[in-house]
Protein backbone atom coordinates (compact mmCIF):
# COMPACT_ATOMS: atom_id res chain seq x y z
CA UNK A 1 0.00 0.00 0.00
CA UNK A 2 1.23 3.65 -0.90
CA UNK A 3 2.62 5.25 2.18
CA UNK A 4 1.23 8.35 3.81
CA UNK A 5 -0.30 9.74 0.36
CA UNK A 6 -0.78 13.64 1.18
CA UNK A 7 -3.19 16.11 -0.95
CA UNK A 8 -2.50 20.03 -1.48
CA UNK A 9 -4.87 22.29 -3.94
CA UNK A 10 -2.37 24.90 -5.35
CA UNK A 11 -5.37 26.24 -7.79
CA UNK A 12 -8.93 25.75 -8.73
CA UNK A 13 -8.24 22.99 -11.34
CA UNK A 14 -5.63 21.41 -9.90
CA UNK A 15 -4.78 19.22 -6.81
CA UNK A 16 -1.24 18.21 -6.00
CA UNK A 17 -1.03 14.41 -4.73
CA UNK A 18 2.20 13.06 -3.03
CA UNK A 19 2.87 9.86 -1.38
CA UNK A 20 5.79 7.24 -0.68
CA UNK A 21 6.74 4.21 -1.79
CA UNK A 22 5.23 0.85 0.11
CA UNK A 23 8.00 -0.06 3.20
CA UNK A 24 7.83 -3.53 1.85
CA UNK A 25 6.85 -4.21 -1.63
CA UNK A 26 5.36 -7.03 -2.76
CA UNK A 27 7.97 -7.25 -5.50
CA UNK A 28 9.04 -4.57 -7.46
CA UNK A 29 6.85 -1.50 -7.60
CA UNK A 30 6.26 -1.03 -11.80
CA UNK A 31 3.88 1.85 -11.43
CA UNK A 32 0.75 3.80 -9.47
CA UNK A 33 -2.43 3.91 -10.67
CA UNK A 34 -4.52 7.75 -9.15
CA UNK A 35 -8.22 7.60 -9.49
CA UNK A 36 -10.40 10.38 -8.46
CA UNK A 37 -14.31 11.34 -8.07
CA UNK A 38 -15.95 14.35 -7.62
CA UNK A 39 -17.58 14.55 -4.26
CA UNK A 40 -21.30 15.43 -3.60
CA UNK A 41 -21.64 18.43 -0.77
CA UNK A 42 -22.97 17.37 2.57
CA UNK A 43 -26.55 17.64 2.51
CA UNK A 44 -26.98 19.65 5.46
CA UNK A 45 -25.14 22.53 3.24
CA UNK A 46 -28.50 22.49 1.18
CA UNK A 47 -30.73 22.14 4.05
CA UNK A 48 -28.98 24.74 6.42
CA UNK A 49 -30.97 28.26 6.33
CA UNK A 50 -27.60 30.56 7.03
CA UNK A 51 -30.04 33.24 7.01
CA UNK A 52 -31.55 32.25 10.82
CA UNK A 53 -30.23 34.36 13.31
CA UNK A 54 -26.56 33.20 15.34
CA UNK A 55 -26.46 30.56 12.51
CA UNK A 56 -22.78 31.26 11.27
CA UNK A 57 -21.34 29.62 7.97
CA UNK A 58 -18.95 26.75 7.58
CA UNK A 59 -15.51 28.09 8.04
CA UNK A 60 -13.29 28.09 5.26
CA UNK A 61 -9.88 28.40 4.35
CA UNK A 62 -9.58 30.82 1.50
CA UNK A 63 -13.27 32.72 2.82
CA UNK A 64 -12.55 36.81 2.89
CA UNK A 65 -13.72 38.37 5.49
CA UNK A 66 -16.79 40.49 5.24
CA UNK A 67 -16.17 43.72 4.82
CA UNK A 68 -16.91 46.13 7.72
CA UNK A 69 -18.53 48.67 6.32
CA UNK A 70 -20.92 46.50 5.11
CA UNK A 71 -21.79 44.30 7.64
CA UNK A 72 -22.75 47.67 10.28
CA UNK A 73 -26.47 46.92 10.11
CA UNK A 74 -28.36 43.47 9.54
CA UNK A 75 -31.87 44.22 9.75
CA UNK A 76 -33.13 41.29 8.96
CA UNK A 77 -30.75 38.67 10.19
CA UNK A 78 -26.81 38.57 11.72
CA UNK A 79 -24.43 36.59 10.24
CA UNK A 80 -20.89 36.79 9.96
CA UNK A 81 -17.84 34.70 9.03
CA UNK A 82 -16.28 32.74 11.62
CA UNK A 83 -15.13 28.86 12.66
CA UNK A 84 -18.65 27.25 12.94
CA UNK A 85 -19.27 24.18 15.34
CA UNK A 86 -19.21 22.33 11.79
CA UNK A 87 -14.99 21.53 10.95
CA UNK A 88 -12.45 19.74 12.77
CA UNK A 89 -9.71 21.19 14.68
CA UNK A 90 -6.38 21.20 13.65
CA UNK A 91 -4.25 18.56 14.69
CA UNK A 92 -1.46 19.09 17.77
CA UNK A 93 1.59 18.20 17.80
CA UNK A 94 1.09 15.40 20.03
CA UNK A 95 -1.71 14.22 18.00
CA UNK A 96 0.39 13.63 14.60
CA UNK A 97 2.99 11.65 17.23
CA UNK A 98 0.20 9.46 17.79
CA UNK A 99 -1.00 8.79 14.69
CA UNK A 100 2.52 8.27 13.32
CA UNK A 101 3.15 5.48 15.95
CA UNK A 102 -0.50 4.11 15.18
CA UNK A 103 0.52 3.95 11.60
CA UNK A 104 3.85 2.14 11.57
CA UNK A 105 1.20 -1.27 13.21
CA UNK A 106 -1.06 -0.12 10.42
CA UNK A 107 1.50 -0.45 7.98
CA UNK A 108 2.61 -3.86 9.43
CA UNK A 109 -0.77 -5.03 9.12
CA UNK A 110 -1.63 -3.37 5.81
CA UNK A 111 1.41 -5.18 4.32
CA UNK A 112 0.06 -8.42 5.86
CA UNK A 113 -3.47 -7.47 3.83
CA UNK A 114 -1.58 -6.77 0.99
CA UNK A 115 0.33 -10.08 0.78
CA UNK A 116 -2.94 -12.08 1.44
CA UNK A 117 -5.69 -10.02 -0.17
CA UNK A 118 -3.93 -9.31 -3.35
CA UNK A 119 -5.88 -7.29 -5.96
CA UNK A 120 -5.86 -8.33 -9.57
CA UNK A 121 -7.29 -5.21 -11.69
CA UNK A 122 -7.84 -5.33 -16.02
CA UNK A 123 -7.43 -1.79 -16.89
CA UNK A 124 -7.23 -2.88 -20.89
CA UNK A 125 -10.01 -0.17 -21.45
CA UNK A 126 -7.85 2.20 -19.82
CA UNK A 127 -10.51 2.81 -17.06
CA UNK A 128 -11.56 1.52 -13.91
CA UNK A 129 -15.23 0.65 -12.68
CA UNK A 130 -16.59 3.23 -10.41
CA UNK A 131 -16.64 2.23 -6.53
CA UNK A 132 -20.31 3.46 -6.11
CA UNK A 133 -19.92 3.46 -2.19
CA UNK A 134 -18.50 6.99 -1.49
CA UNK A 135 -16.88 7.06 1.47
CA UNK A 136 -18.36 8.68 5.20
CA UNK A 137 -15.45 10.63 5.86
CA UNK A 138 -16.86 13.80 6.87
CA UNK A 139 -14.54 16.36 5.48
CA UNK A 140 -13.50 20.18 6.70
CA UNK A 141 -13.95 22.67 4.32
CA UNK A 142 -10.63 23.54 5.53
CA UNK A 143 -9.16 20.32 4.51
CA UNK A 144 -7.90 21.49 1.13
CA UNK A 145 -5.82 24.12 2.09
CA UNK A 146 -3.65 21.72 4.89
CA UNK A 147 -2.23 18.58 4.32
CA UNK A 148 -4.70 15.77 4.66
CA UNK A 149 -3.63 12.35 5.86
CA UNK A 150 -4.99 9.18 4.45
CA UNK A 151 -6.04 6.55 6.18
CA UNK A 152 -5.67 3.23 3.29
CA UNK A 153 -8.61 0.77 4.07
CA UNK A 154 -10.29 -2.23 2.77
CA UNK A 155 -13.54 -1.50 4.57
CA UNK A 156 -16.81 -1.00 2.35
CA UNK A 157 -18.57 1.98 2.59
CA UNK A 158 -21.86 2.61 3.15
CA UNK A 159 -24.01 4.89 1.09
CA UNK A 160 -24.69 8.34 1.72
CA UNK A 161 -26.92 10.96 -0.01
CA UNK A 162 -26.45 12.87 -2.68
CA UNK A 163 -27.55 16.28 -3.20
CA UNK A 164 -25.50 17.64 -5.84
CA UNK A 165 -25.78 15.60 -9.57
CA UNK A 166 -23.63 12.60 -8.98
CA UNK A 167 -21.75 10.30 -11.44
CA UNK A 168 -23.97 8.15 -12.99
CA UNK A 169 -22.83 4.51 -12.45
CA UNK A 170 -22.22 4.19 -16.11
CA UNK A 171 -19.26 6.65 -16.51
CA UNK A 172 -16.03 5.87 -15.39
CA UNK A 173 -13.43 7.36 -13.16
CA UNK A 174 -10.69 9.14 -14.75
CA UNK A 175 -7.55 7.93 -13.62
CA UNK A 176 -3.53 8.38 -14.26
CA UNK A 177 -0.56 5.90 -14.39
CA UNK A 178 2.32 6.83 -12.77
CA UNK A 179 5.79 5.59 -13.72
CA UNK A 180 8.77 6.22 -11.80
CA UNK A 181 7.52 8.71 -9.34
CA UNK A 182 6.18 9.60 -6.02
CA UNK A 183 3.73 12.47 -6.76
CA UNK A 184 0.99 13.68 -9.91
CA UNK A 185 -0.39 16.90 -10.52
CA UNK A 186 -4.31 15.98 -11.03
CA UNK A 187 -5.64 18.54 -13.26
CA UNK A 188 -8.65 20.06 -15.18
CA UNK A 189 -10.53 19.84 -12.27
CA UNK A 190 -13.72 21.96 -11.05
CA UNK A 191 -13.33 24.73 -8.46
CA UNK A 192 -13.86 24.52 -4.85
CA UNK A 193 -14.80 21.26 -4.99
CA UNK A 194 -14.40 18.16 -3.12
CA UNK A 195 -12.34 15.17 -4.69
CA UNK A 196 -11.86 11.03 -3.42
CA UNK A 197 -8.59 10.44 -4.46
CA UNK A 198 -7.90 6.85 -4.91
CA UNK A 199 -4.16 5.66 -4.90
CA UNK A 200 -2.62 1.65 -5.67
CA UNK A 201 0.61 0.67 -6.14
CA UNK A 202 1.05 -2.13 -8.90
CA UNK A 203 4.25 -4.48 -9.24
CA UNK A 204 3.27 -6.00 -12.64
CA UNK A 205 1.95 -4.69 -16.10
CA UNK A 206 1.23 -7.21 -18.05
CA UNK A 207 -0.54 -9.70 -18.70
CA UNK A 208 -2.68 -8.86 -15.83
CA UNK A 209 -2.04 -5.86 -13.41
CA UNK A 210 -1.67 -6.69 -10.08
CA UNK A 211 -2.30 -3.83 -7.58
CA UNK A 212 -2.45 -3.12 -4.06
CA UNK A 213 -5.19 -2.31 -1.50
CA UNK A 214 -6.18 1.27 -1.94
CA UNK A 215 -5.34 4.43 -0.16
CA UNK A 216 -7.74 6.88 0.04
CA UNK A 217 -7.72 10.65 0.39
CA UNK A 218 -9.45 13.66 0.07
CA UNK A 219 -8.97 17.19 -1.16
CA UNK A 220 -10.88 20.52 -2.53
CA UNK A 221 -9.35 22.83 -4.89
CA UNK A 222 -9.30 26.26 -4.32
CA UNK A 223 -11.74 28.80 -4.94
CA UNK A 224 -12.88 30.49 -8.40
CA UNK A 225 -12.15 33.92 -8.01
CA UNK A 226 -15.52 35.46 -9.80
CA UNK A 227 -17.48 32.46 -9.99
CA UNK A 228 -19.72 33.59 -7.22
CA UNK A 229 -20.54 36.72 -8.86
CA UNK A 230 -24.17 37.44 -9.97
CA UNK A 231 -23.91 38.12 -13.74
CA UNK A 232 -26.19 40.32 -15.50
CA UNK A 233 -29.25 42.75 -14.68
CA UNK A 234 -30.47 42.67 -11.51
CA UNK A 235 -34.34 43.64 -12.56
CA UNK A 236 -37.25 44.96 -10.72
CA UNK A 237 -41.33 45.03 -11.23
CA UNK A 238 -43.00 48.16 -8.58
CA UNK A 239 -46.57 45.96 -8.66
CA UNK A 240 -49.57 47.95 -6.81
CA UNK A 241 -49.15 48.69 -3.24
CA UNK A 242 -45.55 49.89 -3.49
CA UNK A 243 -44.68 46.12 -4.11
CA UNK A 244 -41.03 45.74 -5.30
CA UNK A 245 -40.07 42.18 -6.55
CA UNK A 246 -36.19 42.36 -7.21
CA UNK A 247 -35.23 39.35 -9.46
CA UNK A 248 -31.50 38.23 -10.41
CA UNK A 249 -29.51 35.33 -12.10
CA UNK A 250 -27.88 33.03 -9.59
CA UNK A 251 -24.13 32.28 -10.35
CA UNK A 252 -23.69 29.74 -12.61
CA UNK A 253 -20.87 27.90 -11.86
CA UNK A 254 -20.31 28.82 -7.77
CA UNK A 255 -17.61 27.99 -5.64
CA UNK A 256 -19.35 24.73 -4.29
CA UNK A 257 -23.04 26.11 -4.11
CA UNK A 258 -24.92 29.73 -2.95
CA UNK A 259 -25.50 29.49 0.65
CA UNK A 260 -27.18 33.12 0.65
CA UNK A 261 -27.63 36.45 -0.73
CA UNK A 262 -27.45 39.86 0.33
CA UNK A 263 -29.51 42.44 -0.38
CA UNK A 264 -28.44 46.04 0.22
CA UNK A 265 -30.86 48.90 -0.61
CA UNK A 266 -31.38 52.25 0.26
CA UNK A 267 -33.24 55.65 -0.06
CA UNK A 268 -31.97 58.58 -1.50
CA UNK A 269 -30.18 60.40 1.90
CA UNK A 270 -30.75 57.62 3.98
CA UNK A 271 -28.80 54.80 5.85
CA UNK A 272 -28.31 52.02 3.61
CA UNK A 273 -30.30 48.88 4.91
CA UNK A 274 -29.56 45.09 4.36
CA UNK A 275 -31.65 41.79 3.86
CA UNK A 276 -30.44 38.31 4.07
CA UNK A 277 -32.39 36.36 1.08
CA UNK A 278 -31.95 32.28 1.84
CA UNK A 279 -31.23 29.65 -0.64
CA UNK A 280 -34.92 28.42 -0.05
CA UNK A 281 -36.26 31.59 -0.51
CA UNK A 282 -34.42 32.36 -3.36
CA UNK A 283 -35.92 28.96 -4.66
CA UNK A 284 -39.24 30.20 -4.40
CA UNK A 285 -39.05 34.12 -5.51
CA UNK A 286 -35.93 33.96 -7.96
CA UNK A 287 -35.57 37.42 -5.76
CA UNK A 288 -36.83 39.44 -3.13
CA UNK A 289 -39.82 41.20 -2.69
CA UNK A 290 -39.67 44.67 -0.54
CA UNK A 291 -42.51 46.54 0.65
CA UNK A 292 -42.94 49.10 3.66
CA UNK A 293 -40.58 51.33 1.53
CA UNK A 294 -41.22 55.19 1.90
CA UNK A 295 -41.61 57.45 -1.10
CA UNK A 296 -38.69 58.37 -2.94
CA UNK A 297 -34.90 57.32 -5.11
CA UNK A 298 -33.44 53.66 -4.17
CA UNK A 299 -30.78 51.81 -5.40
CA UNK A 300 -30.43 48.42 -4.33
CA UNK A 301 -26.94 46.04 -5.18
CA UNK A 302 -26.78 42.23 -4.28
CA UNK A 303 -24.39 39.95 -3.68
CA UNK A 304 -24.06 36.13 -3.25
CA UNK A 305 -22.39 34.20 -0.55
CA UNK A 306 -21.28 30.43 -1.16
CA UNK A 307 -19.33 27.88 0.63
CA UNK A 308 -15.93 30.22 -0.45
CA UNK A 309 -17.11 33.48 1.04
CA UNK A 310 -18.96 36.47 -0.93
CA UNK A 311 -19.06 37.22 -4.17
CA UNK A 312 -18.83 40.98 -5.18
CA UNK A 313 -21.42 43.13 -5.55
CA UNK A 314 -23.80 43.96 -8.65
CA UNK A 315 -23.55 47.29 -10.49
CA UNK A 316 -26.67 49.54 -8.44
CA UNK A 317 -30.13 49.32 -9.61
CA UNK A 318 -32.28 52.50 -8.79
CA UNK A 319 -36.00 52.48 -8.64
CA UNK A 320 -38.56 54.98 -7.50
CA UNK A 321 -41.45 54.66 -5.34
CA UNK A 322 -43.84 57.27 -5.36
CA UNK A 323 -46.01 56.43 -2.35
CA UNK A 324 -46.59 54.72 0.82
CA UNK A 325 -49.56 52.62 0.84
CA UNK A 326 -48.47 49.31 2.57
CA UNK A 327 -47.50 47.74 6.05
CA UNK A 328 -44.31 48.43 7.32
CA UNK A 329 -42.43 44.76 6.35
CA UNK A 330 -39.14 44.29 4.84
CA UNK A 331 -39.67 41.39 3.02
CA UNK A 332 -42.63 40.70 1.37
CA UNK A 333 -44.77 37.04 0.72
CA UNK B 1 -30.33 16.32 -18.41
CA UNK B 2 -33.03 17.79 -15.92
CA UNK B 3 -35.71 14.46 -16.46
CA UNK B 4 -38.48 14.12 -13.76
CA UNK B 5 -40.25 10.32 -13.97
CA UNK B 6 -43.44 10.08 -12.22
CA UNK B 7 -44.59 5.96 -11.29
CA UNK B 8 -47.25 4.74 -13.39
CA UNK B 9 -50.72 4.59 -13.73
CA UNK B 10 -52.71 3.20 -10.63
CA UNK B 11 -56.41 1.57 -10.17
CA UNK B 12 -57.56 2.02 -6.91
CA UNK B 13 -61.00 1.33 -5.04
CA UNK B 14 -62.38 4.08 -2.62
CA UNK B 15 -61.52 4.33 0.67
CA UNK B 16 -57.86 2.47 -0.10
CA UNK B 17 -54.25 4.23 0.64
CA UNK B 18 -51.80 5.33 -2.40
CA UNK B 19 -48.79 7.08 -2.54
CA UNK B 20 -46.79 7.95 -6.25
CA UNK B 21 -43.95 9.27 -6.89
CA UNK B 22 -41.34 11.40 -9.10
CA UNK B 23 -37.77 10.88 -8.97
CA UNK B 24 -35.93 14.01 -10.26
CA UNK B 25 -32.15 13.75 -11.75
CA UNK B 26 -29.73 15.37 -13.70
CA UNK B 27 -30.14 18.54 -11.10
CA UNK B 28 -29.61 19.03 -7.52
CA UNK B 29 -32.86 18.08 -6.17
CA UNK B 30 -32.50 19.95 -3.19
CA UNK B 31 -32.01 22.94 -4.28
CA UNK B 32 -35.81 23.44 -6.65
CA UNK B 33 -39.25 23.20 -4.92
CA UNK B 34 -41.36 20.41 -6.62
CA UNK B 35 -44.74 21.17 -7.39
CA UNK B 36 -48.14 18.85 -7.80
CA UNK B 37 -50.50 20.09 -10.10
CA UNK B 38 -54.18 17.50 -10.81
CA UNK B 39 -55.88 17.46 -14.02
CA UNK B 40 -59.28 15.71 -13.39
CA UNK B 41 -60.18 14.16 -17.12
CA UNK B 42 -61.52 16.83 -19.91
CA UNK B 43 -60.72 19.72 -17.22
CA UNK B 44 -58.26 22.19 -16.47
CA UNK B 45 -54.99 22.14 -14.29
CA UNK B 46 -55.30 22.83 -10.37
CA UNK B 47 -52.61 23.17 -8.14
CA UNK B 48 -52.03 21.26 -5.30
CA UNK B 49 -49.15 22.64 -3.39
CA UNK B 50 -45.50 22.54 -3.27
CA UNK B 51 -42.35 21.42 -1.36
CA UNK B 52 -38.90 22.27 -1.13
CA UNK B 53 -36.64 18.79 -0.41
CA UNK B 54 -34.15 20.32 1.63
CA UNK B 55 -35.92 20.56 4.42
CA UNK B 56 -39.30 19.29 3.65
CA UNK B 57 -40.99 22.67 3.55
CA UNK B 58 -44.77 22.15 1.90
CA UNK B 59 -47.06 24.67 1.03
CA UNK B 60 -50.65 24.00 -0.04
CA UNK B 61 -53.98 25.16 -1.52
CA UNK B 62 -56.52 25.21 0.78
CA UNK B 63 -58.36 23.33 -2.09
CA UNK B 64 -56.27 20.45 -1.17
CA UNK B 65 -54.91 21.21 2.50
CA UNK B 66 -55.99 17.93 4.67
CA UNK B 67 -56.82 15.96 1.39
CA UNK B 68 -53.25 14.76 0.20
CA UNK B 69 -49.99 14.45 1.90
CA UNK B 70 -47.08 16.02 -0.27
CA UNK B 71 -43.46 15.03 0.94
CA UNK B 72 -39.72 14.01 -0.22
CA UNK B 73 -37.15 11.84 0.23
CA UNK B 74 -33.97 13.65 -0.74
CA UNK B 75 -31.41 10.85 -0.24
CA UNK B 76 -33.00 8.80 -3.67
CA UNK B 77 -34.37 12.40 -5.24
CA UNK B 78 -37.93 11.73 -4.74
CA UNK B 79 -40.80 13.30 -4.43
CA UNK B 80 -44.22 11.94 -2.78
CA UNK B 81 -48.12 13.03 -2.84
CA UNK B 82 -50.41 10.68 -1.04
CA UNK B 83 -53.63 9.64 -0.15
CA UNK B 84 -55.10 8.03 3.12
CA UNK B 85 -58.40 7.28 2.07
CA UNK B 86 -59.45 7.61 -2.06
CA UNK B 87 -62.50 9.43 -3.56
CA UNK B 88 -63.93 8.79 -6.86
CA UNK B 89 -63.18 12.20 -7.32
CA UNK B 90 -59.81 11.73 -6.75
CA UNK B 91 -60.04 10.35 -10.85
CA UNK B 92 -57.39 12.23 -12.41
CA UNK B 93 -53.75 12.89 -14.77
CA UNK B 94 -51.20 14.42 -11.17
CA UNK B 95 -48.01 16.12 -12.37
CA UNK B 96 -45.09 17.07 -10.93
CA UNK B 97 -43.05 20.06 -11.88
CA UNK B 98 -39.99 21.91 -10.96
CA UNK B 99 -40.53 25.35 -9.86
CA UNK B 100 -37.60 26.68 -11.79
CA UNK B 101 -38.33 29.82 -11.75
CA UNK B 102 -39.90 29.54 -8.52
CA UNK B 103 -43.44 30.76 -7.81
CA UNK B 104 -43.42 32.28 -11.45
CA UNK B 105 -42.93 29.14 -13.92
CA UNK B 106 -42.11 25.36 -13.70
CA UNK B 107 -39.78 24.77 -15.92
CA UNK B 108 -39.94 20.74 -16.43
CA UNK B 109 -42.90 18.33 -15.59
CA UNK B 110 -42.93 14.25 -15.03
CA UNK B 111 -45.14 12.83 -17.11
CA UNK B 112 -48.13 12.56 -15.31
CA UNK B 113 -49.51 9.84 -13.36
CA UNK B 114 -53.03 8.62 -14.38
CA UNK B 115 -55.06 7.78 -10.94
CA UNK B 116 -58.42 5.56 -11.26
CA UNK B 117 -60.55 5.64 -8.13
CA UNK B 118 -63.49 3.28 -8.98
CA UNK B 119 -65.62 0.23 -7.23
CA UNK C 1 -60.36 36.63 -4.84
CA UNK C 2 -58.15 33.70 -5.42
CA UNK C 3 -59.40 32.57 -9.27
CA UNK C 4 -57.94 33.78 -12.13
CA UNK C 5 -60.21 34.16 -15.57
CA UNK C 6 -59.57 33.40 -19.15
CA UNK C 7 -62.00 33.42 -22.02
CA UNK C 8 -62.53 29.30 -22.32
CA UNK C 9 -62.10 29.63 -25.90
CA UNK C 10 -60.45 32.01 -28.71
CA UNK C 11 -59.58 31.15 -32.23
CA UNK C 12 -57.04 32.92 -34.92
CA UNK C 13 -56.24 32.82 -38.52
CA UNK C 14 -53.10 31.22 -39.30
CA UNK C 15 -50.18 33.77 -39.28
CA UNK C 16 -52.13 36.41 -37.23
CA UNK C 17 -51.95 37.71 -34.00
CA UNK C 18 -54.05 36.89 -31.18
CA UNK C 19 -54.21 38.06 -27.62
CA UNK C 20 -55.02 35.48 -24.71
CA UNK C 21 -55.87 37.10 -21.32
CA UNK C 22 -56.20 35.92 -17.68
CA UNK C 23 -57.84 38.38 -14.94
CA UNK C 24 -57.86 38.60 -11.24
CA UNK C 25 -57.09 40.68 -8.49
CA UNK C 26 -53.81 39.33 -7.57
CA UNK C 27 -52.25 40.18 -10.64
CA UNK C 28 -52.14 43.59 -9.00
CA UNK C 29 -48.95 42.38 -6.89
CA UNK C 30 -47.77 39.40 -8.73
CA UNK C 31 -45.82 37.55 -11.87
CA UNK C 32 -47.94 35.56 -14.19
CA UNK C 33 -46.59 32.88 -15.91
CA UNK C 34 -48.66 31.28 -18.90
CA UNK C 35 -48.30 27.28 -19.71
CA UNK C 36 -48.82 25.48 -23.44
CA UNK C 37 -51.01 21.75 -23.12
CA UNK C 38 -51.15 19.69 -26.11
CA UNK C 39 -53.88 16.87 -25.70
CA UNK C 40 -52.28 13.48 -23.99
CA UNK C 41 -49.12 15.98 -22.69
CA UNK C 42 -48.11 17.52 -19.79
CA UNK C 43 -47.62 21.46 -19.82
CA UNK C 44 -45.10 23.34 -21.32
CA UNK C 45 -44.10 26.75 -19.90
CA UNK C 46 -43.92 29.81 -22.51
CA UNK C 47 -43.65 32.58 -20.47
CA UNK C 48 -42.66 33.50 -17.21
CA UNK C 49 -42.23 36.41 -14.94
CA UNK C 50 -41.74 39.89 -16.61
CA UNK C 51 -41.80 38.32 -20.09
CA UNK C 52 -39.57 35.49 -20.07
CA UNK C 53 -39.47 32.73 -22.55
CA UNK C 54 -37.73 29.33 -21.40
CA UNK C 55 -35.04 28.44 -24.13
CA UNK C 56 -36.78 26.72 -27.04
CA UNK C 57 -39.73 28.74 -26.78
CA UNK C 58 -40.36 30.89 -30.47
CA UNK C 59 -40.20 34.24 -30.15
CA UNK C 60 -43.53 34.89 -31.15
CA UNK C 61 -44.67 34.28 -27.83
CA UNK C 62 -44.63 37.42 -25.82
CA UNK C 63 -46.11 38.37 -21.84
CA UNK C 64 -47.84 41.49 -20.58
CA UNK C 65 -49.72 43.29 -17.54
CA UNK C 66 -51.26 45.77 -16.72
CA UNK C 67 -53.32 46.33 -13.29
CA UNK C 68 -55.48 42.78 -12.63
CA UNK C 69 -55.18 41.81 -16.57
CA UNK C 70 -51.86 39.70 -17.84
CA UNK C 71 -51.76 38.72 -21.63
CA UNK C 72 -50.18 36.24 -23.52
CA UNK C 73 -49.66 37.47 -27.28
CA UNK C 74 -48.86 35.24 -30.32
CA UNK C 75 -47.78 37.39 -33.11
CA UNK C 76 -48.16 35.20 -36.34
CA UNK C 77 -49.33 32.42 -35.33
CA UNK C 78 -48.78 28.73 -36.25
CA UNK C 79 -50.89 25.47 -36.74
CA UNK C 80 -48.59 23.98 -34.34
CA UNK C 81 -49.50 26.54 -31.37
CA UNK C 82 -53.25 25.20 -31.05
CA UNK C 83 -53.44 24.16 -27.55
CA UNK C 84 -55.01 25.13 -24.29
CA UNK C 85 -52.69 27.79 -22.34
CA UNK C 86 -53.16 28.29 -18.72
CA UNK C 87 -52.08 31.32 -17.14
CA UNK C 88 -50.68 31.23 -13.63
CA UNK C 89 -49.80 33.16 -10.32
CA UNK C 90 -49.99 33.44 -6.72
CA UNK C 91 -53.52 33.68 -4.75
CA UNK C 92 -53.51 37.75 -3.32
CA UNK C 93 -52.35 35.82 0.29
CA UNK C 94 -48.99 34.76 -1.79
CA UNK C 95 -49.47 31.62 0.30
CA UNK C 96 -50.19 29.20 -2.84
CA UNK C 97 -50.16 29.37 -6.64
CA UNK C 98 -53.70 29.28 -8.89
CA UNK C 99 -54.12 28.28 -12.62
CA UNK C 100 -56.35 30.33 -14.82
CA UNK C 101 -59.02 28.17 -16.35
CA UNK C 102 -57.75 27.65 -19.45
CA UNK C 103 -57.92 29.28 -22.79
CA UNK C 104 -58.62 26.59 -25.87
CA UNK C 105 -56.54 28.01 -28.78
CA UNK C 106 -57.87 27.27 -32.31
CA UNK C 107 -55.84 28.45 -35.41
CA UNK C 108 -57.42 28.37 -38.38
Known amino acids: VPLDPISVSNSSSQIILKWKPPSDPNGNITHYLVFWERQAEDSELFELDYCLKGLKLPSRTWSPPFESEDSQKHNQSEYEDSAGECCSCPKTDSQILKELEESSFRKTFEDYLHNVVFVPRKTSSGTGAEDPRPSRKRRSLGDVGNVTVAVPTVAAFPNTSSTSVPTSPEEHRPFEKVVNKESLVISGLRHFTGYRIELQACNQDTPEERCSVAAYVSARTMPEAKADDIVGPVTHEIFENNVVHLMWQEPKEPNGLIVLYEVSYRRYGDEELHLCVSRKHFALERGCRLRGLSPGNYSVRIRATSLAGNGSWTEPTYFYVTDYLDVPSNIAK | EVQLVQSGAEVKKPGESLKISCKGS????????IGWVRQMPGKGLEWMGIIYPGDSDTRYSPSFQGQVTISADKSISTSYLQWSSLRASDTAMYYC????????????WGQGTLVTVSS | SSELTQDPAVSVALGQTVRITCQGD??????TSWYQQKPGQAPVLVIFGKNNRPSGIPDRFSGSSSGNTASLTITGAQAEDEADYYCNSRDSSGNYAVFGGGTQLTVL
Open chain 3, 26 to 31: SLRSYY
Open chain 2, 26 to 33: GYSFTSYW
Open chain 2, 97 to 108: ARLGSGWYGNDY
